[in-house]
Amino acid sequence: EPHSLRYNLTVLSWDGSVQSGFLAEVHLDGQPFLRYDRQKCRAKPQGQWAEDVLGNKTWDRETRDLTGNGKDLRMTLAHIKDQKEGLHSLQEIRVCEIHEDNSTRSSQHFYYDGELFLSQNLETEEWTVPQSSRAQTLAMNVRNFLKEDAMKTKTHYHAMHADCLQELRRYLESGVVLRRTVPPMVNVTRSEASEGNITVTCRASSFYPRNIILTWRQDGVSLSHDTQQWGDVLPDGNGTYQTWVATRICRGEEQRFTCYMEHSGNHSTHPVPSGKVLVLQSHWQHHHHHHGLNDIFEAQKIEWHE
């Protein structure tokens, strides 16, 4: 997988008036890395591993960059003409990647009220607009504003691309991201399925990097894909990942089944616990949280794009 840096900024308006402040999160290699602390007006690392990336250096540069980006996005939102009453959001996601062959990719995406309306490849400067008429109108609005703004010249987009890559390389130089391995915690649970059957679920949590093999075995042999259900490998908010795999088995045959896990060159096997059947409500229902937007406008539903 490529190394990536992703900026996720959101600004809000209420009854046509752009609100002060902004929400910002930065993800490094898909993990929450920085967020903008509105109270302290500073970029803050998310967890110990993020702190380790910069070591004893300050986060002033990140604070300056996020503040500047937030200000730009507020100005952009102010130029969107169709703002009706109530709450509206403008979200910008900027991503840059360095691939194994050292090739790079950069892109920028704008969302209005959670709907994508404009994308740009920052290397080719090619714009993409979805088909819907609303998206076309919004995109025209924003592109016109960006063209008017002297700052949004060709050099600006090259700079955005270069700056993002420069930052990504700076973070990678620390070696923390490349070196870091956190082994998973694995646990197996069982739940009532139907008459004579039980569902066994194997969960792996708190691991890094995200690549993992998690599969059920019967008598030491991996079950076929169609007899297993997998959950997505998702960030758990602590700079690590979580996932699960489940299968249905006949009661009384538990001893034949083990969950096999392989991660970063290490492996383990985990038997099905015997004894009382636990009745679980559901298998790890993953909810997409709104990362702080709820704090401001609890009653309003703003879609947050991951």
Epitope: D219, V221, S222, Q255, R256, Y260, T269
Partner: antibody, heavy 118, light 107 residues
């Protein structure tokens, strides 16, 4: 490549016990089960049981419960089968086998001949 | 326990022949059927697993088929090195059980 090297032939007296070893090489020992199979002279094969080397978990053929005990030594990548209270019925060639995770008994040891005789 | 029956205990064939060895289970084993080759020196090798999947390194002249309770192993072009005893084995239900074997000889 995967190899299972079994211990040499054993001649034991009735009532005694014997421990057959199976040393694995060419793969990560704790990744895959070790299975044991019996073949009496000129007869078919009988599955005895298997062990998960990672955690020592065992599953036995009911017929061999109390007769065979399966263990492993992770440090030497060796699996053992202990047979007790031997009788002439236990005279046979004993095989260990392992899996590649996709099929049972994928790779086999060369077999160990156990002869029970007074 | 599931009984695995190989009705033909020995079989004579000529080099180049197409040979089929059959195996019957006492109940449905859902394709969990494997075939093994045992050479006269006692060496055992996996040939086919899950009814028809060829184990890596096994010559393509070996093939397997079947479903439910009836299964077969076919050698399409018999070679000298195929002289051995062939065992079927079910992996569907514990305890795992083997057929009594079919000894293949050259005419």
């Amino acid at each position: 490549q995967v190899q299972l090297q079994q211990s040499g032939p054993e001649l034991v007296k009735p009532g005694a016990s014997v421990k057959v070893s199976c040393k694995a090489s060419g793969y990560a020992f704790t990744k895959y089960n070790i299975y044991w199979v019996k073949q009496s002279h000129g007869k078919s094969l009988e599955w005895i049981g298997y062990i998960d080397p990672y955690n020592g978990g065992t599953v036995y053929n009911q017929k061999f419960k109390g007769k065979a005990t399966l263990t492993v030594d992770k440090s030497s990548s060796t699996a053992y089968m202990h047979l007790n209270s031997l009788t002439s019925e236990d005279s046979a060639v004993y095989y260990c086998a392992t899996t590649d995770g996709y099929s049972l008994f994928t790779y086999w040891g060369q077999g160990t001949l156990v002869t029970v005789s007074a | 326990d599931i009984q695995m029956t190989q009705t033909t205990s020995s079989l004579s064939a000529s080099l180049g022949d197409r040979v089929t060895i059959s195996c019957r289970a006492s109940q449905d084993i859902s394709n969990y059927l494997n075939w093994y080759q045992q050479k006269p020196d006692g060496t055992v090798k996996l040939l086919i697993y899950y009814t028809s999947r060829l184990h890596s390194g096994v010559p393509s002249r070996f093939s397997g088929s079947g479903s439910g309770t009836d299964y077969s192993l076919t050698i399409s072009n018999l070679e000298q090195e195929d002289i051995a005893t062939y065992f079927c084995q079910q992996g569907n239900t514990l305890p795992f059980t083997f057929g009594s074997g079919t000894k293949l000889e050259i005419k």
